[in-house]
């Protein structure tokens, strides 16, 4: 056969379903890789041609649209299982073509099983919710296109193995499900199940989604700088690792990206010809509050190392601040000596400054180590 | 340390009702889901409902369905299964177990109630 | 509902042998079954979940293996309080249903 325009295998697209439920699955062709509808192609005079290759095997067979009950059927740029079974498992190639065209993508279809609490390998979608925000639903997800409007379908919705019916602040709205006020015991797995009727025949749809209460933007603020700060000054000696922790606490918010830098006298460690070493670690409060730290070393300080400015940086969707670390030179105690055989001496302070260091640890979800010269 | 402290043992007479109850410890009462489960002697075991208080829901084997109630008191962390139209084949150990409502495995288990229904 | 049907009833076994207890199901229950092990006078306690997974505190010498229709618990070097009744549970549908059980005691 003549060449066709090949994406390949569309692994962005791991498409999971659960066993013995109706399921819709788009040719990919016209929603991420064409820029024209299935209606344009199909008035074309393109045609849509489905095959699979099933899982362990390399042999790509058509599919089977001659089963009982139209089990597999095409309608439009859809394919129909109606239910999907185990050994439907795949990848699943549409391709679409005429004479002087062809265009085929390829895309992995997995059929899942669950247990009795809806329990399943099935990656579940997060849907946050604000905590102690006034009313907050979700809906339930990927259900549309199943049933016609006129149908009127019944919808349940669990919280792992149990019916929600009396859960003091959560209540079910067919198919949304109101929280009337989110706190963190209301973070879980929230399945809705689906069921309508078709041709005579009684279908399921399980929707199994995670909810995770996070903090309202009511008390959103802007980043806040902990250390440095004005309490903690740091004195070395030329020779000595000097160790500045930066830590910054930021409010969630959603989708903001929460940014911490050093800079010294004003450049990034990166444009200075020092050996600078930077150790970023993170970690989250119950609520998605997150914690930065960045700990600047200098493995062996120089006296004219002591005498730049070192400023962190911080900056989300609330704003931008900066705070300088208080670094200084530490003096050496003069030595005094007793001058004569057998003079008394008198008393002498002697001021030794104090070295402070604090070092921020444990717990920390992640860690990144950048090395600057 | 989780743990389920149930009733003492109970004869009741056919026809009438029992309630057995299962107190927990350990853990938000709330966030977990109590089952009970029936051994009858020298028999195995039968999973008969299970109720998850913080939902307010309740499930049933269909074998016991409208002859079993299970219900929960948040205030004490006291599960209850009461029994009605007692039989004399319902003579048997009762026991609640507990796991998250997730899970429908049986991690914690009380030390039994025995029931003898006898005339 | 799915019937779970154990086998053998009894199992006689020397200490240091190694036991194999079957259960199988009507239908296929996936991987979701439980193993329980219950000795005269005491309440079960949960051995395994997810046909494989080892509860906590459960020694290494309990393994469970299968999936669908057909699971195997193994005890691979029995100690004298191994002797007890094991029963599986199925959750894949409900009700949840157990096995009659299998007696291991003493050869």
């Known amino acids: 056969s003549e060449r066709c325009d090949d994406w390949g295998l569309d692994t962005m697209r791991q498409i999971q379903v659960f066993e013995d439920e109706p399921a819709r699955i788009k040719c990919p062709l016209f929603e991420h890789f064409l820029k024209f509808n299935y209606s344009t192609a199909h008035s074309a005079g393109l045609t849509l041609i489905w095959y699979w290759t099933r899982q362990d095997r390399d042999l790509e067979e058509p599919i089977n649209f001659r089963l009982p009950e139209n089990r597999i059927s095409k309608e439009k740029d859809v394919l129909w299982f109606r239910p999907t079974l185990l050994n439907d498992t795949g990848n699943y190639t549409c391709m679409l073509r005429n004479t002087t065209y062809c265009s085929k993508v390829a895309f992995p279809l997995e059929v899942v099983q669950k247990d009795s609490c809806f329990n399943s390998p099935m990656k579940l979608p997060v849907h946050k919710l604000y905590i102690e925000y006034g009313i907050q639903r979700i809906t339930c997800p990927n259900v549309d296109g199943y049933f016609p409007s006129s149908v009127k379908p019944t919808i349940t919705w669990y919280m792992g193995c149990y019916k929600i019916q009396n859960f003091n602040n959560v209540i079910p709205e067919g198919m949304n499900l109101s929280f009337l006020i989110a706190f963190i015991s209301n973070n879980g797995n929230y399945t809705c199940v689906v069921t309508y009727p078709e041709n005579g025949r009684t279908f399921h749809l399980t929707r199994t989604l995670t909810v995770k209460v996070v903090g309202s933007p009511k008390n959103a603020v802007p980043p806040v700088i902990h250390s440095p700060n004005d309490h903690v000054v740091y004195e070395k000696e030329p020779g000595e690792e000097l160790l500045i922790p930066c830590t910054v606490y930021f409010s969630f918010l959603m989708d903001s990206r929460n940014e911490v830098w050093w800079t010294i006298d004003g450049k990034k460690p990166d444009d200075i010809p020092i050996d600078v070493t930077i150790n970023e670690s993170i970690s989250h409060s119950r609520t998605e509050d997150e914690t930065r730290t960045q700990i600047l070393s200098i493995k062996k300080v120089t006296s004219e190392d002591l005498k730049r400015s070192y400023v962190c940086h911080a900056r989300s969707a609330k704003g931008e601040v900066a705070k300088a670390a208080t670094v200084k030179q530490k003096v050496p105690a003069p030595r005094y000596t007793v001058e004569g055989g057998g003079g008394t001496g008198g008393l002498n302070d002697i001021f030794e400054a104090q070295k402070i260091e604090w070092h921020e640890g444990g717990g920390h979800h992640h860690h990144h180590h950048h090395h600057h010269h | 340390q989780v743990q389920l402290v149930q009733s003492g043992a109970e004869v009741k007479k056919p026809g009438s009702s029992v309630k057995v109850s299962c107190k927990a410890s350990g853990g938000h009462f709330s966030q977990f889901a109590i089952s009970w489960v029936r051994q009858a002697p020298g028999q195995g075991l039968e999973w008969m409902g299970g109720?998850?208080?913080?939902?307010?829901?309740?499930r049933y084997a269909q074998k016991f369905q409208g002859r079993v109630t299970i219900t929960a008191d948040e205030s004490t962390s006291t599960a209850y299964m009461e029994l009605s139209s007692l039989r004399s084949e319902d003579t048997a150990v009762y026991y609640c177990?507990?796991?998250?409502?997730?899970?429908?495995?049986?991690?914690?288990w009380g030390q039994g109630t025995l029931v003898t229904v006898s005339s | 509902e799915i019937v779970m049907t154990q086998s053998p009833a009894t199992l006689s076994v020397s200490p240091g042998e190694r036991a194999t207890l079957s259960c199988r199901a009507s239908?296929?229950?996936?991987?979701?079954l439980a193993w329980y092990q219950q000795k005269p006078g005491q309440a079960p306690r949960l051995l395994i979940y997810g046909a494989s997974t080892r509860a906590t505190g459960i020694p290494a010498r309990f393994s469970g293996s299968g999936s669908g229709t057909e699971f195997t618990l193994t005890i691979s070097s029995l100690q004298s309080e191994d002797f007890a009744v094991y029963y599986c549970?199925?959750?894949?549908?409900?009700?949840?249903?157990f096995g009659q059980g299998t007696k291991v005691e003493i050869k």
């Open positions: 109720i998850a208080p913080g939902l307010g829901s309740t």
């Open positions: 239908q296929s229950v996936s991987s979701n």
């Open positions: 549970q199925q959750y894949n549908n409900w009700p949840w249903t």
């Open positions: 177990a507990r796991d998250s409502i997730y899970s429908a495995w049986l991690a914690y």
